[in-house]
Each structure stands twice: as structure tokens, then as C-alpha cells.
Interface confidence: low
């Protein structure tokens, strides 16, 4: 039988009446154009909604926008457009919401052509009040908050000036001209690239990378011949043009650009690209594009310095620079990532790693599913997940995979079951163990979201027809109830719930439509009365993550330790609550070969835990450049996975010797770097 329709499914008692009492409709009193929604702060209940319209096929001449505010998680909204003097807000800049619970909001206004500069509206009290500020420049980008101090803002101007404010946008100062890209680093540091000759585009590959640690009082040039740069975890990366040709290489710094090392990654040509797929304080996943317009590349994983890389996955699907990749960090279980590979026959297959890129495998076939037409063997196939690439290809996939750190083990995604991703209409699958096993959760494409740290999953069918029904599950997607939230169906445009999945409120957004008038409408449903009581100790059960063989003493060991979690029983219908904290108990494991990645010059053949020498490097000395000195690597092929906590057990030899020889990439060596003050 279909999921949720067998006899085992107990119905939630009296849920229709409970939900009806907690369903709040709000009709927005304006024509429907586009809508953007932002949460202001965490657990504040404050939502800002900006509607803008400039509508063809409807008699409208001017763009107009309205601003609405809710302070009860979307149950009621107040039109606060007058607080921004009924100004047209530029949607391409969105609403710049301050970090953490600063309560800061910046809106960028549309101004008439001849004006000296742009205009912003600033709030520092969760959008209760706004101050209008005229800018001495026209912004090119959204205002960017310093992660450390929400009073510090930076923006680029349309004339490529870098502007900084130290008092939350009240006063602005241009600290540098000819700037292409600027980013906040840690400790209120700003990194930016500058051009010397024509423009950012013309100077690509000849840019300079600068740093200021005092908001523009003094500067240090930390790199030249720069193509681009990026920050990930504690690493600063720059792609740098080679001296002799048009190739470029990645250089990495862990000290804010004072010293650099060349990353042991292949160089790339003009048409290729590098991309940081994921980064934390331990390591980096780096994609290196293949030569030619192949649509794929190779994933490499770094050591703890970001310098030495191991090949992690071949033929990784990544279409073009800034294009589509399915690479997904499964945030509900440590070490798990999902992505797609392009096989030799040009079909796309999903791969998963449970050990941070050490080994990749196909996803296990869901037990309640049949292999589709793509499968050569009808009994042997796997689950393939639809993500960004499928969405970009306009397949019937309304949402990317979903996981939440506080909904341990839960992953929800659209997929198909076969030898490769299918273009047929997908179904929705769920894993409750971080991707090891999967079950078909819903037939056909749906929008979905997680509430109350996994205590409730909500879904809405993806349809071109108007809808009025929402589905919900209190047992991690095994059984589903349906609730009709309105008599008059609406054209559905999106589900909105507070980021972090701790809320019990869901907002359903859509519009009612006639040819000349179209109105936004939202329905906010509070599930608090469905989960009537707070969860108690008896509602939780002990779960060992990454468990594949309970008989094995090392069962559950991933990255050198295992973790036991307290997880809500599927049968318990209770509230985890907003203050729910994931309870976990780690324990250290003995080291095995699984705790080591293949070292520079080595790779792991498929389905083998041993690392073997790369044929092209056999018999060569393994030397690489570190902080401008040549290093010699003595290794039997293994290095500890960054972040791996194992102790004892297997201990492969690894030694790095300073060859006392100078080596330079074409990058500025530290002693040549210059500083200047304003």
C-alpha cells in the first residue's frame, strides 16, 4: 500500500478542530507582483514581507512595493510601508538582515536617475522603526554585515568603490577605488581584489588581493596576479595566474594572507574553474573542473592545512562556472555528503559519502520501491536524488534535499529508483539514519519542511492547479494526515517556516487570481495543539549513528569516534520544544585504515581501503611547496582525515622534511608583501 495508508497508521486525535483553531489567514491588500520574506532574529517571531510589482499583462505603470511586518510568526501582518515613506524597494538587493539577534535590517530603495547616490532604510529594533539615509554612492551589491560586529557594513558602488560604515549605515567612507570583490573575514577583516588598468573583467588574472584589518585605515597587499579568491572555514583561497601561460593555481593561507602555500591541486585553464564545495575549520572539499566542456570534474579533499589534497570523487557533476552541482552537506549527520556523478554513458547517478569524502557509494535501494526503466537488472538498482541540477533542468522537482542539524538522521529528497536519475515524475524519499537507508515517503513531487526538530514533517503536493490541502506526519514520514486549510484553493508559491526547524508554525504562501487583480495570501498553521504535551525521557530512545554492523566492536566509528544520540521515538506525539538540544554521547575509536585519507601521490581503488601509488608519480620524489620552502614527503600513502579523533590502532608512517630549498609559486612571497596606510 502507499505510504501512510496501511492499518498501522494511528490517526492523530481531533486534529482537524485543533488545526482549524490555529489556522490564520492574511490577505495582502495589494496587487500580486513578487514577494520576499525574511525572518528577523531567532525565536523573535518577527517576519518582514516585501511585495513588489511591476506587472505586464495587467494595467500598471509604476513599480510599487509594500512592506509588512509580523511579530507572531506570520499569523498577523501589519502594513508598515509608511515607515519607509512608501518608497519602492529594490528587490534584487533583498532585505539585508543583521547577524545573530542584532535586530538590524537594511532595505535599499530605488532612486531616480539623476540622484547623487542611493538611499537605504535602516532599522535596529527588529523593523519597528526605520531611519532613511541617503548614500554618497549608488550601491552595486547588498550591504554586507561584519559577522563580528553588526554595526560594521560594507558595500560596493556602481563605480567599483569599496565603501564602509562603522555606525550601521549612518555615515559611509570610501576606503578604496577599483574594487572587484570584497568579503568580510574574521575579526572585522576585509579582503578585496582591485584592478589597476581597465576593469575587473579586463584585469581578471591580474588583480591584486588586499586586506585591511582596521576598516580602511591601513592596507596590505597580500597577493598579485589574482583571478579570484574565496573564504571557507579558516582557509583563505586565491586562484593565481601562472607566470608562463594562461593556467591558474589555487594558493591557500591559514593566517589571513600573511603566508601562502600552493595547494597540491591540478592547475586549470581559461575555460576551467575551481569551486569550494564545502569547508569547515578542519578541511575543504574542492571541485576542480575537467578541461573541455565536459560538465564534470574531480572532488579533492584537503588536509588540515588545506595544502595537500586527495582525490575523493571522479566525474563529479558540475556544469559550468557558477553553474549547477548537486553537492549537498547532509547536516543531520556528521560526515555525510551527497552529490551526483556523470557516468560514461552520460547518465547521472547519485553518490553518498559517510566519512567526509573518504569513500563514496551508491544510495541503497528503498525497500518499498521497484527499480524503474533505467535499471538493467530489475532487482539491483539504487536511489538517485534530485538536487540543484535537476531543478535547473526544469524537471518536476520543486525542492532540493532537506536536512536539519537538530533533526538528527533525517534527510528528505526527491528521487528515482534505478541505475541513474530519471526524467520521470519523481517521488519523495526519507532517510531516518543519515542516508544509509531510505523509504518512499510520498508519491509524486512535494514541497516539504521539518518542524519541531523533526517532531513534525509538513508537505504540500506540487501542482499547477490551486491547492487547499496540507499533509503532515508526526512519525518521521511513515504515516500522513491531510488537513484542508482553506475552502477556496490558492495558487501555491511556497512554504515558509522559521530557519532552524525549531518552530511549530508553518506559513503557506500563494495567491488568488483574476485577470486584473491578483492578491498574495498566507495561511499560518500552528501545530502546537497537535503535539499537546512536552516530550519526556520515556519518549526518547538511544540511537547509534553510522551503525551498520551491531556485532562489530567498531560499529558506528566514523572519523575516529562514534556517537550515540537520544532520539524521539516515532510513536511519541509530543513537543521537542524550541529549547530542544540534541543529546549525544561521543566515544573514541581505535584507528584503522578508514581513518586515513590517501596521501599526496596516492589514491584508493574503488572498494578498497588500501592506498596505492598514483602510476604517474611512481618512483618520483614527493616534493611540494610550503610557505615558500620545498618540502619532501616521506609517506606510505596515508594521512589522518582532518577532524578524525581516533587513537591507537593502525599508525601509518608520515614525515615531512624541510629540503631547505627555496621555491616560489608566482605569488608574492611574504617578504615582498607591502603595506600602506591611508
Amino acid at each position: 500500500s502507499a505510504p501512510g495508508e496501511d492499518e498501522e497508521c494511528g490517526r492523530v486525535r481531533d486534529f482537524v478542530a485543533k488545526l482549524a483553531n490555529n489556522t490564520h489567514q492574511h490577505v495582502f491588500d495589494d496587487l500580486r507582483g513578487s514577494v520576499s520574506l525574511s525572518w528577523v532574529g531567532d525565536s523573535t517571531g518577527v517576519i518582514l514581507v516585501l511585495t513588489t510589482f511591476h506587472v505586464p499583462l495587467v494595467i500598471m505603470t509604476f513599480g510599487q512595493s509594500k512592506l509588512y511586518r509580523s511579530e507572531d510568526y506570520g499569523k498577523n501582518f501589519k502594513d508598515i510601508t509608511d515607515l519607509i515613506n512608501n518608497t519602492f524597494i529594490r528587490t534584487e538587493f533583498g532585505m539585508a538582515i543583521g547577524p545573530e539577534n542584532s535586530g538590524k535590517v537594511v532595505l535599499t530603495a530605488e532612486v531616480s536617475g539623476g540622484s547623487r547616490g542611493g538611499r537605504i532604510f535602516r532599522s535596529s529594533d527588529f523593523a519597528k522603526n526605520f531611519v532613511q539615509t541617503d548614500l554618497p554612492f549608488h550601491p552595486l551589491t547588498q550591504m554586507m554585515y561584519s559577522p563580528q560586529n553588526s554595526d560594521y557594513l560594507l558595500a560596493l558602488s556602481t563605480e567599483n568603490g569599496l565603501w564602509v560604515s562603522k555606525n550601521f549605515g549612518g555615515k559611509w567612507e570610501e576606503i578604496h577605488k577599483a574594487v572587484c570583490l570584497a568579503k568580510w573575514g574574521s575579526d572585522n577583516t576585509i579582503f578585496f581584489t582591485t584592478y589597476a588598468n581597465g576593469s575587473c573583467k579586463a584585469d581578471l588574472g591580474a588583480l591584486e588581493l588586499w586586506r585591511t584589518s582596521d576598516l580602511g585605515k591601513s592596507f596590505k597587499t597580500i597577493g598579485v596576479k589574482i583571478y579570484s579568491f574565496g573564504l571557507g572555514g579558516r582557509f583563505l583561497f586565491a586562484s593565481v595566474m601562472a607566470d608562463k601561460d594562461t593556467t591558474r593555481r589555487i594558493h591557500v593561507s591559514t593566517d589571513q594572507g600573511d603566508t601562502w602555500s600552493m595547494a597540491q591541486l591540478p592547475s586549470v585553464g581559461q575555460e576551467q574553474f575551481y569551486s569550494i564545495l564545502a569547508a569547515n575549520d578542519d578541511m575543504v572539499f574542492m571541485h576542480v573542473d575537467e578541461p573541455g566542456d565536459t560538465g564534470f570534474g574531480t572532488i579533492f579533499t584537503s588536509d588540515d592545512r588545506g595544502i595537500v589534497y586527495s582525490k575523493s570523487l571522479d566525474r563529479h557533476l558540475y556544469t559550468t562556472t557558477g553553474g549547477e552541482t548537486d553537492f549537498t552537506n547532509v547536516t543531520s549527520l556528521r560526515g555525510v555528503y551527497i552529490t551526483s556523478v556523470l557516468s560514461e554513458d552520460n547518465s547521472i547517478q547519485t553518490m553518498i559519502t559517510f566519512d567526509q569524502g573518504g569513500r563514496w557509494t551508491h544510495l541503497r535501494k528503498p525497500e518499498n520501491s521497484e527499480c524503474d526503466a533505467t535499471a538493467k537488472n530489475k532487482n539491483e538498482c539504487s536511489l538517485h536524488i534530485h538536487a540543484s541540477y535537476s531543478i535547473s533542468q526544469k524537471l518536476n522537482v520543486p525542492m532540493a534535499p532537506l536536512s536539519e542539524p537538530n533533526a538528527v538522521g533525517i534527510v528528505i529528497a526527491h528521487g528515482s529508483v534505478g541505475d541513474a536519475i530519471s526524467v520521470m515524475v519523481p517521488d519523495v524519499y526519507i532517510s531516518d539514519d543519515g542516508g544509509y537507508s531510505w523509504t518512499k515517503m510520498l508519491e509524486g513531487p512535494h514541497y516539504y519542511t521539518i518542524l519541531d526538530s523533526g517532531g513534525i514533517i509538513v508537505a504540500i503536493e506540487h501542482s499547477s492547479r490551486p491547492i487547499n490541502v496540507i499533509k503532515f506526519s508526526t512519525d518521521e514520514g511513515q504515516c500522513w494526515q491531510t488537513y484542508t486549510f482553506t475552502r477556496d484553493p490558492i495558487y501555491f508559491t511556497g512554504l515558509a517556516s522559521e530557519p532552524g526547524a525549531r518552530s511549530m508554525n508553518i506559513s503557506i504562501w500563494g495567491f488568488t487570481e483574476s485577470f486584473l487583480t491578483s492578491q498574495w495570501v498566507s495561511y499560518t498553521i500552528d501545530f502546537k495543539d497537535i503535539l499537546e504535551r512536552n516530550c519526556e525521557e520515556k519518549d526518547y530512545t538511544i540511537w547509534l549513528a553510522h551503525s551498520t554492523d551491531p556485532e562489530d566492536y567498531e560499529d558506528g566509528c566514523i572519523l575516529g569516534y562514534k556517537e550515540q544520540f537520544l532520539r524521539l521515538r516515532k510513536s511519541s506525539v509530543c513537543q521537542n520544544g524550541r529549547d530542544y538540544v540534541v543529546t549525544k554521547q561521543p566515544s573514541i575509536c581505535l584507528c584503522s585504515l578508514e581513518d586515513f585519507l590517501c596521501d599526496f601521490g596516492y589514491y584508493r581503488p574503488e572498494n578498497d581501503s588500501k592506498c596505492v601509488e598514483q602510476p604517474e608519480l611512481k618512483g618520483h620524489d614527493l616534493e611540494f611547496c610550503l610557505y615558500g620552502r620545498e618540502e619532501h614527503l616521506t609517506t606510505n600513502g596515508y594521512r589522518k582525515i582532518p577532524g578524525d579523533k581516533c587513537q591507537g590502532g593502525v599508525n601509518p608512517v608520515r614525515e615531512v622534511k624541510d629540503l631547505k630549498k627555496k621555491c616560489t609559486s608566482n605569488f608574492l612571497s611574504p617578504e615582498k608583501q607591502n603595506s600602506k596606510s591611508n
Epitope: 500580486r32 507582483g33 513578487s34 514577494v35 510589482f53 511591476h54 506587472v55 505586464p56 499583462l57 495587467v58 494595467i59 500598471m60 505603470t61 513599480g63 499547477s464 492547479r465 495558487y491 508559491t493 511556497g494 495567491f511 487570481e513 483574476s514 485577470f515 486584473l516
Partner: antibody, heavy 124, light 106 residues
């Protein structure tokens, strides 16, 4: 691939009406706007009106207001344009065209798919 | 209704020429403008939407620019297949077309 197939040529007497059909295949009919555009011999293009089949409400160019009726039947994925009180200057090729549109808000893509055209001749 | 004025109405050019057609709106239409190509006896074909976005499958020698009231369609290097009539069309209210520009062989 979306296709729009129109009904055949018509010869009409002045004062009568003509109803031209436009059948869509290979895509979601309801989420697009359908526009009707005509072209008199040797003349340029003239927009008559449009409809969003999923919503049923039509909009007409001022010039044709009261004389043209645009409807849609979702079940057959067909749009219709009926022009009444025909006169000789209504002799033209009548096209239906798909107007791209994003669910959730309008996003103008232009008329990206056209029917083959229906010749309507008004003559006594 | 917004009026769209296209110029020139006829344009003689040779293969390889750079061709520019202008379209002026009677009031600002932001970027809600499309360009079409039509050959005798055929339905129009969409080339450019939203003033400057190239429709998929259209050769890159076609480009559009402008916003507000002034718009241009440029063919960077005229090909034999490009001799046709070109129309602009606005969609900032009721839809209206320009009068057309016939590009003929010099």
C-alpha cells in the same frame, strides 16, 4: 516541446462572427497566458487580447473591447478567440501565441511559441 | 495605450553588415520589451525578451539593449537568413507592437 495548433481558414460575411481555436500540446496549458495577435495583409502585428487559462479571466486591447471574446477550455487545452460584427478590414491572419509566465508572479518571457496562423477572410 | 515607434521602417543592408533597429516607447516601459523576427507567410519568432535576454536557440549575433523608452536590436553580422521583418513589442500594460522594420538585401 509545446505546440499550438490552430483551426483552419474561414471565409465570413460582413456582420457575422468567427471563432478560431488554438489547441496546446506538450506542456502545462493552465500556467501560461495565451495572447491573440492578428496581421492584416501587408500590415504589422496587432495584439487583440489575452487569457490565462488557469484563471479564465481575459484582457482585451481597447480597439477590440466589446467585439472580441477570448475563452479557454482547460480540459482540452484549447483557447478560443471569437470576433463579432466582422467587417472587411478584419481580413487577416490570426495567431495565438504562448506568453511565458512564472507561477507566483509575472515574469515576462515574450511570446515564445506561436500557432501556425488562421486566415480569416471577410467578404460579401 | 503605450505607442511603440520603430525606425527605420525599411533598411537595406548586405551580408556581414552590422544592423541596428531602434524602438521608442511613448512612456517608460522599464525592460518589458521583446523583439521578433517574421518571414513572409510564417509566424513571428521570439528573438529577445526582457529587452536584452536572448531566447534559447537564437544565434548570438542578435542582441538587445535599452530600458525605459529607448531600445535597440543589433545584428552584429547580417547573415542571408536574417533578411526578414523585425517587430518590437512592449508588455508594460496592454501589449502593443511596433510598426516593423523590413531588412532587405542592398
Amino acid at each position: 516541446q509545446v505546440q499550438l495548433v490552430q483551426s483552419g481558414a474561414e471565409v465570413k460575411k460582413p456582420g457575422s462572427s468567427v471563432k478560431v481555436s488554438c489547441k496546446a500540446s506538450g506542456g502545462t496549458f493552465s500556467s501560461y497566458a495565451i495572447s491573440w495577435v492578428r496581421q492584416a495583409p501587408g500590415q504589422g502585428l496587432e495584439w487583440m487580447g489575452g487569457i490565462i487559462p488557469g484563471f479564465g479571466t481575459a484582457q482585451y486591447a481597447q480597439k477590440f473591447q466589446g467585439r472580441v471574446t477570448i475563452t479557454a477550455d482547460e480540459s482540452t487545452s484549447t483557447a478560443y478567440m471569437e470576433l463579432s460584427s466582422l467587417r472587411s478590414e478584419d481580413t487577416a491572419v490570426y495567431y495565438c501565441a504562448r506568453q511565458g509566465r512564472k507561477t507566483g508572479y509575472y515574469y515576462y518571457y515574450g511570446m515564445d511559441v506561436w500557432g501556425q496562423g488562421t486566415t480569416v477572410t471577410v467578404s460579401s | 495605450d503605450i505607442q511603440m515607434t520603430q525606425s527605420p521602417s525599411t533598411l537595406s543592408a548586405s551580408v556581414g553588415d552590422r544592423v541596428t533597429i531602434t524602438c521608442r516607447a511613448s512612456q517608460s516601459i522599464s525592460s518589458w520589451l521583446a523583439w521578433y523576427q517574421q518571414k513572409p507567410g510564417k509566424a513571428p519568432k521570439l528573438l529577445i525578451y526582457k529587452a536584452s535576454s536572448l531566447e534559447s536557440g537564437v544565434p548570438s549575433r542578435f542582441s538587445g539593449s535599452g530600458s525605459g523608452t529607448e531600445f535597440t536590436l543589433t545584428i552584429s553580422s547580417l547573415q542571408p537568413d536574417d533578411f526578414a521583418t523585425y517587430y518590437c513589442q512592449q508588455a508594460d500594460g496592454h501589449i502593443t507592437f511596433g510598426g516593423g522594420t523590413k531588412v532587405e538585401i542592398k
